[in-house]
């Protein structure tokens, strides 16, 4: 029985040329996370975080995507084409697969300065990862 839930950063906005952190967190389950896949709106994979082997950044994004913090992903040098949906897929044992959605809107710099951000940081739980210990999670 799948009891877990995925919490994500939800709808977020960021400036063109800037960077943004995509973050998902699996809670309410004791299932073991074996792998997290990060996908873009067109279903192309950005990155894999395998629990045993670590990170793999797909070649098309190697210059613009940085692993972490935690199981999240940092997308850099944003372009207008980066606007759209992003998905985190958690492969777990024994539960199976959980999927979370984030919508990123990339704004022209001038617009971004006068626009209210979608994301409202709220104090969240700390969680542990093999690579990065105790990263604050915003949801």
């Amino acid at each position: 029985m799948m009891t877990g839930t995925i919490e994500t950063t939800g709808n977020i906005s960021a400036k063109k040329g800037g960077s943004v952190i995509l973050q998902c967190h699996l809670s309410s389950t004791m299932a073991q996370v074996t792998q997290v896949n990060w996908e873009q709106h067109d279903h192309s994979l950005l990155a894999i975080r395998n629990a045993e082997l670590g990170w793999h950044i797909y070649p098309a994004f190697k210059d613009r995507v940085a692993p972490g913090p935690g199981l999240g992903l940092t997308l850099q040098s944003l372009t207008m084409n980066d606007t759209g949906e992003y998905f985190c897929t958690y492969h777990t044992y024994p539960d199976g697969t959980y999927r979370g959605r984030i919508f990123l809107e990339v704004l022209e710099s001038s617009v971004a300065e006068h626009s209210a951000r979608f994301q409202i940081p709220i104090e969240g739980r700390d969680y542990k990862d093999d690579d990065d210990k105790h990263h604050h999670h915003h949801h």
């Epitope: 896949n37 894999i48 045993e52 082997l53 070649p59 098309a60 190697k62």
Partner: antibody, heavy 121, light 106 residues
Framework: EVQLVESGGGLVKPGGSLRLSCAAS????????MSWVRQAPGKGLEWVGR??????????DYAAPVKGRFTISRDDSKNTLYLQMNSLKTEDTAVYYC????????????WGQGTLVTVSS | SYELTQPPSVSVSPGQTASITCSGD??????ACWYQQKPGQSPVLVIY???KRPSGIPERFSGSNSGNTATLTISGTQAMDEADYYC?????????FGGGTKLTVL
């Protein structure tokens, strides 16, 4: 220690079939993307195809010369990779290697010794 | 279909720097890998993901990849480095090898 051992090669007539196996050990096989690469006598390396891990869909990709004739599969419970070769041609004669795709820093293991497939009448 | 072009042969004196190039359309958007193969032996991965060295590969081997060209550089080349070298373009949908370069240490 990461180890890959290919087997199943041999002499087969044009139009025939053969199934190659690759026994993997020393790593968690189910995590790996695996490829088959071949090398004709005195020639260079040629990628045959690959199979992704189940957590990446377990999908397969093939090089144009073998598409529709060769099928790659895996049995994670047996730590074994397979290459089913049908409608073999003389130009398929080569040493066949199974390899680990270099996705991860800690899993870039050595190649096996390969297995020779000879297609001749 | 995607193609990679390597020079058939490169010569270098011991102790000097050898550079082997590999060219392909927008190769910089893919990962470049390099394999070393000595006569009668299986290939050995010497560079992966453009510039990373697997454990056990000497520091004199380095790689770069941008634009349409990937380069394998061997600094302080030794006689034992004489071999065939193959570049490989790797992405999530396909893999392609170059034709190979025979490195001769004079």
């Amino acid at each position: 220690e990461v180890q890959l051992v290919e087997s199943g090669g041999g002499l087969v007539k044009p139009g025939g079939s053969l199934r190659l196996s690759c026994a993997a050990s020393g790593f968690t096989f189910s995590n790996a993307w695996m490829s088959w690469v071949r090398q004709a006598p005195g020639k260079g390396l040629e990628w045959v195809g690959r199979i992704k891990s189940k957590t990446n869909g377990g999908t397969t990709d093939y090089a144009a010369p073998v598409k529709g004739r060769f099928t790659i599969s895996r049995d994670d419970s047996k730590n074994t990779l397979y290459l089913q070769m049908n409608s073999l041609k003389t130009e398929d004669t080569a040493v066949y290697y199974c390899t680990i795709d270099p996705l991860y820093d800690i899993l870039t293991g050595p190649w096996g010794q390969g297995t020779l497939v000879t297609v001749s009448s | 279909s995607y193609e990679l072009t390597q020079p058939p042969s490169v010569s270098v004196s011991p102790g000097q720097t050898a550079s082997i190039t590999c060219s392909g359309d927008k190769l910089g958007d893919k990962y470049a890998c390099w394999y070393q193969q000595k006569p009668g032996q299986s290939p050995v991965l010497v560079i992966y993901q453009d510039s990373k060295r697997p454990s056990g590969i000497p520091e004199r081997f380095s790689g770069s990849n941008s634009g349409n060209t990937a380069t394998l550089t061997i600094s302080g080349t030794q006689a034992m480095d004489e071999a065939d070298y193959y570049c490989q373009a790797w992405d999530s949908s396909t893999v392609v090898f170059g034709g190979g370069t025979k490195l001769t240490v004079l």
